[in-house]
């Protein structure tokens, strides 16, 4: 089981939208996949995917979760607030047929206040 997460760094304006993507791959098929998003080590949500569907569509405050076959798990934060800033990690585990787990690298989300004078010019960078 492999998990790749992106972007590494994401800067957005307060009130806008942030999208974090987790790519989950396994050479063989799986029947049920447990997924988890954490922010600064705290669990935001821990649904599972089976029959092509997520057991839960919400993930933390203003967070929406979606699954796009074959491998993309997306966490969309909308609207973004200042307290969304932090380090996000995606984790996945195949529960059926046999246990295998993996996690992505950290996505650091920076939320700028909705104030042009405080805007900093950071670049969103994705893994190569």
């Amino acid at each position: 089981l492999s998990v790749q997460q992106g972007p590494n760094l994401l800067q957005v304006r307060q009130g806008s939208q942030a999208t974090l993507v987790c790519q989950v791959d396994q050479a063989t098929a799986w029947e049920r996949l447990r997924v988890k998003w954490t922010k600064d080590g705290a669990i935001l949500c821990q649904p599972y995917i089976t029959n092509g569907s997520l057991s839960l569509g919400v993930c933390g405050p203003q967070g929406r979760l979606s699954w796009q076959a074959p491998s993309h798990l997306t966490l969309q934060l909308d609207p973004v607030s200042l307290n969304h800033s932090g380090a996000y990690v995606c984790w996945a585990a195949v529960e059926i047929p046999e246990l295998e787990e993996a996690e992505g690298n950290i996505t650091r989300l920076f939320v700028d206040p909705d104030d042009p004078t405080q805007n900093r010019n950071r670049i969103a960078s994705f893994p190569g």
Epitope: D25, Q26, A27, T28, A29, L33, A69, P70, P97
Partner: antibody, heavy 120, light 113 residues
Framework: QVQLQESGPGLVKPSQTLSLTCTVS??????????WNWIRQFPGKKLEWMGY???????SYNPSLKSRVTISRDTSKNQFSLKLSSVTAADTAVYYC????????????WGQGTLVTVSS | DIVMTQTPLSLPVTPGEPASISCRSS????????????LDWYLQKPGQSPQLLIY???YRASGVPDRFSGSGSGTDFTLKISRVEAEDVGVYYC?????????FGQGTRLEIK
Amino acid sequence: QVQLQESGPGLVKPSQTLSLTCTVSGFSITTGGYYWNWIRQFPGKKLEWMGYIYTSGRTSYNPSLKSRVTISRDTSKNQFSLKLSSVTAADTAVYYCADMADKGGWFAYWGQGTLVTVSS
Amino acid sequence: DIVMTQTPLSLPVTPGEPASISCRSSQSLFSSNTKRNYLDWYLQKPGQSPQLLIYHASYRASGVPDRFSGSGSGTDFTLKISRVEAEDVGVYYCQQHYETPLTFGQGTRLEIK
């Protein structure tokens, strides 16, 4: 360019242990998300997957080989190995090593194969 | 174990003519989670190791001529060669990676008439 090369004795006596090594070049076997496989081809051309060792060190074996098979690795040499115990003439085959990735699941690169004959 | 059954086992073809190989699995190789079929096709040319032709039932591997195509879903799959060339001679295998143990078809030997 990824290359896999099998090595080991071409002749093994019945009841002994068959030992083969696959040396990988152009790619690290510790790279995440990869399975390092052994596959054999019998004289009649039938292919049989024997097992793999994953990046994490986890192994999976073909139940048809029962407890006769062991796959291990030496990351310092970028090699992985096959041991098959209590061999009989029925284990005579061409033995291949091959890689497989989580992204895809197919056997992308194969060694050239090595013929192992079990005979006294 | 998933049993893979290929037909025919031998296939004599005239150059320039089409060829078709069937592969049937004892259980479905389609995943509703990933929307993929876990079925690949390989060609083993004389004296060589097998080489990937088609992955996930219908996707041509890099460098494979477009005269090769794969189709099917679930338990029934087909490999087609639109116009056979002399270099296509060898043994063709289907293989499932839906689950372990990974299993292959018996192979179909394509020969030139």
